[in-house]
């Protein structure tokens, strides 16, 4: 039975040209995290595998950085980066948990970030 829950940063905004940290946290389960995928609706960005380490999709190599932790840092943001992002936690024995983050990249310099996310 899957008892865990994923906490995410929810809806966040950032300034064009800047950086943003995408962060999720899996709680309320003792399941072992074997892999975390970071994906857009139609594109794999990166994988953090417990054994293999980080693997960044080659097309994002220049502007995606691993971490902090199991999170992902997006750099040199463009308006085209606006959209949904998913953290997909592969766990044993529970199975797969998916969290959703919506990022809005703003043209102006008054982009207000959502409440800072902290891992307990």
């Amino acid at each position: 039975m899957m008892t865990g829950t994923i906490e995410t940063t929810g809806n966040i905004s950032a300034e064009k040209g800047g950086s943003i940290i995408l962060q999720c946290h899996l709680s309320s389960t003792t399941a072992q995290v074997t892999q975390v995928n970071w994906e857009q609706q139609d594109q794999l960005l990166a994988i953090c595998n417990a054994d293999l380490g980080w693997h960044i999709s080659p097309s994002f190599k220049d502007r995606v950085a691993p971490g902090p932790g199991l999170g992902l840092t997006l750099q040199s943001l463009t308006v085209n980066d606006t959209g949904e992002y998913f953290c997909i936690y592969h766990t044993y024995p529970d199975g797969t948990y998916t969290g959703r983050i919506f990022l809005e990249v703003l043209e102006s310099s008054v982009a207000e970030h959502g409440a800072r996310f902290q891992i307990p």
Epitope: L44, N49, L52, W54, H55, K61, G95, T96
Partner: antibody, heavy 121, light 113 residues
Framework: QVQLQQPGAELVKPGASVKMSCKAS????????MHWVKQTPGRGLEWIGA????????SYNQKFKGKATLTADKSSSTAYMQLSSLTSEDSAVYYC??????????????WGAGTTVTVSA | DIVMTQSPDSLAVSLGERVTMNCKSS????????????LAWYQQKPGQSPKLLIY???TRESGVPDRFSGSGSGTDFTLTISSVQAEDVAVYYC?????????FGGGTKLEIK
Amino acid sequence: QVQLQQPGAELVKPGASVKMSCKASGYAFTNYLMHWVKQTPGRGLEWIGAINPGSGGTSYNQKFKGKATLTADKSSSTAYMQLSSLTSEDSAVYYCARTGVYGNFLIFDYWGAGTTVTVSA
Amino acid sequence: DIVMTQSPDSLAVSLGERVTMNCKSSQSLLNSGIQKNYLAWYQQKPGQSPKLLIYGASTRESGVPDRFSGSGSGTDFTLTISSVQAEDVAVYYCQNDHRYPFTFGGGTKLEIK
């Protein structure tokens, strides 16, 4: 163009070890995971494990832990798999295969031609 | 581990005939959060390495003829060849692309009558 070059055949004695190579060319070696797959007439295709040439991290199918050891040499863009304590059960074709990113998926997009390992006294 | 079961083991068809082969997984390969199925199909012709045909259960790899199509979701998947050609003689494998260890089906061997 992407190429994965493997030696055609290896003849080894029972109890010995063999180290086979997979030389990659035509792409950035450290940007892609490399996998190894075993094929026998009886059991079909079996995933042995993978290596991240960038970090050196490895992941193994539990069945092949202790049997296979994966390494990679960044300077020569070559992945290696060593098989130890060989028996007739290890006689098979061994493929190296790269995974590329296809949308949301990591897919075996390029395969070597395979190395046929024959274990015989 | 996810067990992949293919059926039939083999089939012989006439040129131009429509053929379907099935693949069943012991666990769901669907991530319902993003509505993606982590299943791939490979074709292996005699004496050759496997070649990618379809990924994501239904997306054809570039250069694969449109007579090949994939369908299904969750645990049940199908590969269809709408009009079999002589060059389609091969063994077809489905593969769990969802989680390690990646696992393959036992294959379906396609022959021409």
